[in-house]
């Protein structure tokens, strides 16, 4: 059976393609695909920020090659940023044990 | 219940701290901690590459700030690289559906 970290990487890849294949370039997320991914797969990150300007800003921040889409590399950078935010929270509570899966 | 992608990010964080806290700086992986993490948590990635020179080379590639340790940001870059390798494999088989979790 795959280890949890390998499963986690597999989830990162499969989640991207679950949404990227819906419209246009099947290997990139356009704005509506990104919005759907965030809303359904990262609700804790998104919170109440569902207004159009917030999505536009996020899209712009992720889209480093400025093609109005988020490719897999840009998506990985995004997930790494969220992971680093989670890690900062974790390191702020050094006695807190990692949640057991 | 947390969504699979949120769980995946949690696993990324918790796996790092499971090993980083064993010796020295508890928020960084030294070479032996990294070796143990790779061997136990990413056996598919590691494969047969268990020789010392390979570990040294990997450690050197990950350690972008040259402090002989891998911090969380460097670890995220590493995982992103593995995810991108997995994604390239995935995109090479466009008809392959994402594995359902």
């Amino acid at each position: 059976m795959a280890c949890p970290l390998e499963k986690a990487l597999d989830v990162m890849v499969s989640t991207f393609h679950k949404y990227s294949g819906k419209e246009g370039d099947k290997f990139k997320l356009n704005k509506s695909e990104l919005k759907e991914l965030l809303t359904r797969e990262l609700p804790s990150f998104l919170g109440k920020r569902t207004d159009e300007a917030a999505f536009q800003k996020l899209m712009s921040n992720l889209d480093s090659n400025r093609d109005n889409e988020v490719d897999f590399q840009e998506y990985c950078v995004f997930l790494s940023c969220i992971a680093m935010m989670c890690n900062e929270f974790f390191e702020g509570f050094p006695d807190k044990q990692p949640r057991k899966k | 219940m947390a969504c699979p992608l949120e769980k995946a990010l949690d696993v990324m964080v918790s796996t790092f701290h499971k090993y980083s806290g064993k010796e020295g700086d508890k928020f960084k992986l030294n070479k032996s901690e990294l070796k143990e993490l790779l061997t136990r948590e990413l056996p598919s990635f590691l494969g047969k590459r268990t020789d010392e020179a390979a570990f040294q080379k990997l450690m050197s590639n990950l350690d972008s700030n040259r402090d002989n340790e891998v911090d969380f940001q460097e670890y995220c870059v590493f995982l992103s690289c593995i995810a991108m390798m997995c994604n390239e494999f995935f995109e090479g088989f466009p008809d392959k559906q994402p594995r359902k979790k």
Epitope: K31, K57, S60, N65 | -
Partner: antibody
């Protein structure tokens, strides 16, 4: 309101470097915008040169790639253009612009422009 | 690079006229098309972005349409302050590229 102001020498000798500064007021270098350099040649043709944005991400026009450098100083709300090995073909009005985060990333604010003449 | 071709390069019109300017891209730009107005001695000003969205403060007599490679800017009733040069610009991919401009002159 956002205002951009270009500054720098109006005359540059061939083979030398052109250096311009854009000072931004009314907005800070937030992660939401990219900051661009665009030039307009005497015949009115507009050319996008490059930009700097989120996390210091930089993109250049490939036609200038070996000669151009864009940097910024977030503490001063300024960004800079350096173009090396200039020729008379680089004579143009140089504009600094802000690139919006909206669809298509339009240039929503422009400086008034500064004319740079390359001549011996 | 994506080439942007504007037509006509100039036109003469009278106040109150309906004016149409076209812009053609060398490949599909997926509606990522922006329009600018420039008056002599001034910097260009954004009019419309993403084909048809009006930038704040721009009068509603300006409108845009199109898809794929072909796009249009329309001024429904030309006003004296509209005599200027108009540029299209693709925001689909890098490097950003502009059309050659259309000069709208008084007939």
């Amino acid at each position: 309101d956002v205002q951009l102001q270009e500054s720098g020498p109006g005359l540059v000798k061939p083979s030398q470097s052109l250096s311009l500064t854009c000072s931004v007021t009314g907005d800070s270098f937030t992660n939401d915008y990219y900051w661009n350099w665009i030039r307009q040649f005497p015949g009115s043709k507009l050319e996008w040169m490059g930009h700097i944005g989120y996390g210091g991400n930089i993109n250049y026009n490939p036609s200038l790639k070996n000669r151009i450098s864009i940097t910024r100083d977030t503490s001063k709300n300024q960004f800079f253009l350096r173009l090396t090995s200039v020729t008379t073909e680089d004579t143009a009005t140089y504009y600094c612009t802000r690139e919006s985060f909206y669809d298509g990333y339009p240039f929503d604010y422009w400086g008034q422009g500064t004319l740079v003449t390359v001549s011996a | 690079d994506i080439q942007m071709t504007q037509s006509p390069s100039s036109l003469s019109a009278s106040v109150g006229d309906r004016v149409t300017i076209t812009c053609r891209a060398s490949q599909d730009i997926r509606n990522y098309l922006n329009w600018y107005q420039q008056k002599p001695g001034k910097a260009p000003k954004l009019l419309l972005y993403y084909t048809s969205r009006l930038h704040s403060g721009v009068p509603s007599r300006f409108s845009g349409s199109g898809s794929g490679t072909d796009y249009t800017l329309t001024i429904s009733s030309l006003q004296p302050e509209d005599f200027a040069t108009y540029y299209c610009q693709q925001g689909n991919s890098l490097p950003r590229t502009f059309g050659g401009g259309t000069k709208v002159e008084i007939k």
